[in-house]
C-alpha cells in the first residue's frame, strides 16, 4: 500500500504524474483516479478511455510508462492522485501522488511602521505585506541576511552605527517561487526611496 509521493508545482504549469519504478509486466489495466472515487482515464486492452471530469481535454496518458500529463494545473487540482494497475495475476497495485499546486508569490510591499533615531542607534520596524499567503520570509540588510529569529513578516530591530545598512530587502518565498521587495534609507535613519 505504502507508495506515496509528494509533488509541489506552480499553478499554470504542465505536470507529469508518474512513478519512479517500472510498471508490472503485461498489466491488464491501468487507471488514474482523482480522489478515491473519480476516474480520470483508464487504459484497457490497448485503448484509453477518458472519463467526464474536470480534467477532460487537458490530460493525456502514456500507457508505456503510466505517466499522466496534466496541462495548466490550478490550485483546485490539489488532491491525492492514485494510479491503479491491475496485474495479469488478477491482483492490483496502487501508487499515490499528493499534488500541491501553489500560486507564485506576489511581489511584497514593505511598509515602514516606525523609524526612530535613538542615541545614534536606529530603531526600525518594517512589515512585509503580501495578500493572505502561506510563505517564508527572509530579511536582508544590504544583501546580508538577518539572524533566523528575525525572519517573519515584521522586522523589528535596533541598529548600531557599525551594522547600519542602507537598503533592506524582504524576500517572500514558497516552494515554487520567490519575490523581493526593497526599501532604502538615508543615513542616519530616514526614508530615501522604495
Amino acid at each position: 500500500q505504502g507508495h506515496l509521493v509528494h509533488m509541489t508545482v506552480v499553478s499554470g504549469s504542465n505536470v507529469t504524474l508518474n512513478i519512479s519504478e517500472s510498471l508490472p509486466e503485461n498489466y491488464k489495466q491501468l487507471t488514474w483516479f482523482y480522489t478515491f472515487d473519480q476516474k480520470i482515464v483508464e487504459w484497457d486492452s490497448r485503448k484509453s478511455k477518458y472519463f467526464e471530469s474536470k480534467f477532460k481535454g487537458r490530460v493525456r496518458l502514456d500507457p508505456q510508462s503510466g505517466a499522466l500529463y496534466i496541462s495548466k494545473v490550478q490550485k483546485e487540482d490539489n488532491s491525492t492522485y492514485i494510479m491503479r494497475v491491475l496485474k495479469k495475476t488478477g491482483n492490483e497495485q496502487e501508487w499515490k501522488i499528493k499534488l500541491q499546486v501553489l500560486d507564485p508569490v506576489p511581489k511584497p510591499v514593505i511598509k515602514i511602521e516606525k523609524i526612530e533615531d535613538m542615541d545614534d542607534n536606529c530603531y526600525l520596524k518594517l512589515s512585509c505585506v503580501i495578500p493572505g499567503e502561506s510563505v517564508n520570509y527572509t530579511w536582508y540588510g544590504d544583501k546580508r541576511p538577518f539572524p533566523k529569529e528575525l525572519q517573519n513578516s515584521v522586522l523589528e530591530t535596533t541598529l548600531m552605527p557599525h551594522n547600519y545598512s542602507r537598503c533592506y530587502t524582504c524576500q517572500v518565498s514558497n516552494s515554487v517561487s520567490s519575490k523581493n521587495g526593497t526599501v532604502c534609507l538615508s543615513p542616519p535613519c530616514t526614508l530615501a526611496r522604495s
Partner: antibody, heavy 120, light 107 residues
C-alpha cells in the same frame, strides 16, 4: 488480524438520527477506504457511501445524500455513519466494510453489523 | 447508476450438481465485479473479485467468469455448506451497486 467492531443495536423513533461506529484494528487505518452497506430485513445489500480516512474525502449513494454523514476519527481508528430523519424503511442491519485498496471497493472485511430499528 | 441484474432469484439443486448464477450489468463494467456469499444471520463473505480471481481461502469449486456486461459464478460440485444467498457487485463506477441476490437451496 483485521477487525472491524461496530457499536450495538439501536431503537429509534421516526425523525430521529442514529450514529453507528466502527472501530478498526489490525491494519493502518488511513491506507484503505471505509464503506457502509445496509441490509433491510430479508432484502439485499445496498451501498450507502465510502470515506477515505486519510483525506476525509467522501462518496455517497445519491439516495442518502443529505441524510447520511460519514466521518472518521484517525486518533482512535474509528469510522462513523450518521443517518438523520429516520423513517421505518431505514430499519436494517448497517455494516462497515473495508475496501481492498483506496480505489478498489470490494469488501473482504466486514463489521459484525448493527441493527437499527425505526419504530414509533 | 449501473444496475446489476441477477438470475435466477432462487434455485434448488442437489449435492454434487454444477450450479451457475448469472449477473448482467446495465453498462460495461470491464472486469470490476465481485461475488459474495451470505449465509443466514451472517456477514457477507468475498468469494471472487476482478470477475475471476478467487479470494484467499475460497474453495476451488467456486469460479467466476465474464467481462463487459455478462458475468457468471459457477459452483462445480455443490456441497451442503454452500446453502446461502449469493450477490454480485460492480465496483467499476460509483455508486457501487449489488445484484438483488440469488438464494441457493439444496434439493
Amino acid at each position: 488480524q483485521v477487525q472491524l467492531v461496530q457499536s450495538g443495536a439501536e431503537v429509534k423513533k421516526p425523525g430521529a438520527s442514529v450514529k453507528v461506529s466502527c472501530k478498526a484494528s489490525g491494519y493502518t487505518f488511513t491506507e484503505y477506504t471505509m464503506h457502509w452497506v445496509r441490509q433491510a430485513p430479508g432484502q439485499g445489500l445496498e451501498w450507502m457511501g465510502g470515506i477515505n480516512p486519510d483525506t476525509g474525502d467522501t462518496s455517497y449513494n445519491q439516495k442518502f445524500t443529505g441524510r447520511a454523514t460519514l466521518t472518521v476519527d484517525k486518533s482512535t481508528s474509528t469510522a462513523y455513519m450518521e443517518l438523520s430523519s429516520l423513517r421505518s424503511e431505514d430499519t436494517a442491519v448497517y455494516y462497515c466494510a473495508r475496501a481492498q485498496f483506496w480505489t478498489t471497493p470490494r469488501f473482504a472485511y466486514w463489521g459484525q453489523g448493527t441493527l437499527v430499528t425505526v419504530s414509533s | 447508476d449501473i444496475q446489476m441484474t441477477q438470475s435466477p432469484s432462487s434455485l434448488s439443486a442437489s449435492v454434487g450438481d454444477r450450479v451457475t448464477i448469472t449477473c448482467k450489468a446495465s453498462q460495461d463494467v470491464g472486469t470490476a465485479v465481485a461475488w459474495y456469499q451470505q449465509k443466514p444471520g451472517k456477514v457477507p463473505k468475498l468469494l471472487i473479485y476482478w470477475a475471476s480471481t478467487r479470494h484467499t481461502g475460497v474453495p476451488s469449486r467456486f469460479s467466476g467468469s465474464g467481462s463487459g456486461t455478462d458475468f457468471t459464478l459457477t459452483i462445480s460440485s455443490l456441497q451442503p455448506e454452500d446453502v446461502a444467498t449469493y450477490y454480485c457487485q460492480q465496483y467499476s463506477t460509483y455508486p457501487i451497486t449489488f445484484g438483488q441476490g440469488t438464494k441457493l437451496e439444496i434439493k
